[in-house]
């Protein structure tokens, strides 16, 4: 029986050109997290595997950084980044938990969760 719940940042907005941290949190279960997938609609952004570490999809490599923790940081946001993002937690023995975040990228200055990482 799956007892866990996923908490996400929910609906968030950020400024065009800015940064955002996407975070999900799995609670209320003792299941071991074996992998977390981050997806944008049907497109894979990144995988965080407990044994293999991070894999960032090549098309996002220059503006995505892993972390903090199992989260994901998106940089240099464009209006095209507006949409649904999913964190998919693969766990043992529970199975799969999915969380949803809706990101709206705005032209105005309504940025949240500004990230501190830099990619030269």
């Amino acid at each position: 029986m799956m007892t866990g719940t996923i908490e996400t940042t929910g609906n968030i907005s950020a400024e065009k050109g800015g940064s955002i941290i996407l975070q999900c949190h799995l609670s209320s279960t003792t299941a071991q997290v074996t992998q977390v997938n981050w997806e944008q609609q049907d497109q894979l952004l990144a995988i965080c595997n407990a044994d293999l570490g991070w894999h960032i999809s090549p098309s996002f490599k220059d503006r995505v950084a892993p972390g903090p923790g199992l989260g994901l940081t998106l940089q240099s946001l464009t209006v095209n980044d507006t949409g649904e993002y999913f964190c998919i937690y693969h766990t043992y023995p529970d199975g799969t938990y999915t969380g949803r975040i809706f990101l709206e990228v705005l032209e105005s200055s309504v940025a949240e969760h500004g990230a501190r990482f830099q990619i030269p």
Epitope: H25, L52, G53, A65, P68, G69, F117
Partner: antibody
Framework: EVQLQQSGTVLARPGASVKMFCKAS????????MHWVKQRPGQGLEWIGA????????NYNQKFKGKAKLTAVTSASTAYMELSSLTNEDSAVYYC??????????WGQGASVTVSS | DIVLTQSPATLSVTPGDSVSLSCRAS??????LHWYQQKSHESPRLLIK???QSISGIPSRFSGSGSGTDFTLSINSVETEDFGMYFC?????????FGGGTKLEIN
């Protein structure tokens, strides 16, 4: 087997700079953050910053911005930390550790830096 | 920055005792809390990840609990090899931070 091999002991003068290394083996170097942690004698652990070799992303503790510079040579699976304008307060053991999202699961043996005139 | 406060600073116990070490965060960090053990003149070692998840190779007498701001590392029947320093660390937000540590010593 995952291993993080760090530089040896360094003795430096106040005002000088030192660059230490952390050579990784046994895993995909570009898939993990490399963290650097400071420990003064008899004290706790202090997070300096981290470098992600996958795309050269960095994150610093504000306290160490301007003091520590983190870099890496991916082809050599080696991370570096340069400490500048050394003072007695920089005398410590410095650890590198890797993190792939699930805690810092492997640590180097530590590199000792002593600043003395 | 998130401040992690560990208590007690020192804990004197007898082998065979069961103990609890506390780590309190200055704001909610959900379950993004990890525990490390450091023996004298050694590097830290990861004991527990994400507040309660076990680590391969770590004895089952070590367990973790908590969420939000209050976390506990429990050692069921302390053995002599368990004496040393214990640190908590958060990965909820940058910059990562460590607690000040709890020293577990022989009574």
């Amino acid at each position: 087997e995952v291993q993080l091999q760090q530089s040896g002991t360094v003795l430096a003068r106040p005002g000088a700079s030192v660059k230490m290394f952390c050579k990784a083996s046994g895993y995909s170097f570009t898939s993990y953050w490399m963290h650097w942690v400071k420990q003064r004698p008899g004290q706790g652990l202090e997070w300096i910053g981290a470098f992600y070799p996958g795309n050269s992303a960095t994150n610093y503790n504000q306290k160490f911005k301007g003091k520590a510079k983190l870099t890496a040579v991916t082809s050599a699976s080696t991370a570096y930390m340069e400490l500048s304008s050394l003072t007695n307060e920089d005398s410590a053991v410095y650890y590198c550790s890797r993190e792939g999202g699930y805690g810092m699961d492997h640590w180097g043996q530590g590199a000792s830096v002593t600043v003395s005139s | 920055d998130i401040v992690l406060t560990q208590s007690p600073a020192t804990l004197s116990v007898t082998p065979g005792d069961s103990v609890s070490l506390s780590c309190r965060a200055s704001q909610s960090i959900r379950n993004n809390l990890h525990w490390y053990q450091q023996k004298s003149h050694e590097s830290p070692r990861l004991l527990i990840k994400y507040a309660s998840q076990s680590i391969s190779g770590i004895p089952s007498r070590f367990s973790g609990s908590g969420s939000g701001t209050d976390f506990t590392l429990s050692i069921n029947s302390v053995e002599t090899e368990d004496f040393g320093m214990y640190f908590c660390q958060q990965s909820n937000s940058w910059p990562y931070t460590f607690g000040g540590g709890t020293k577990l010593e022989i009574n």
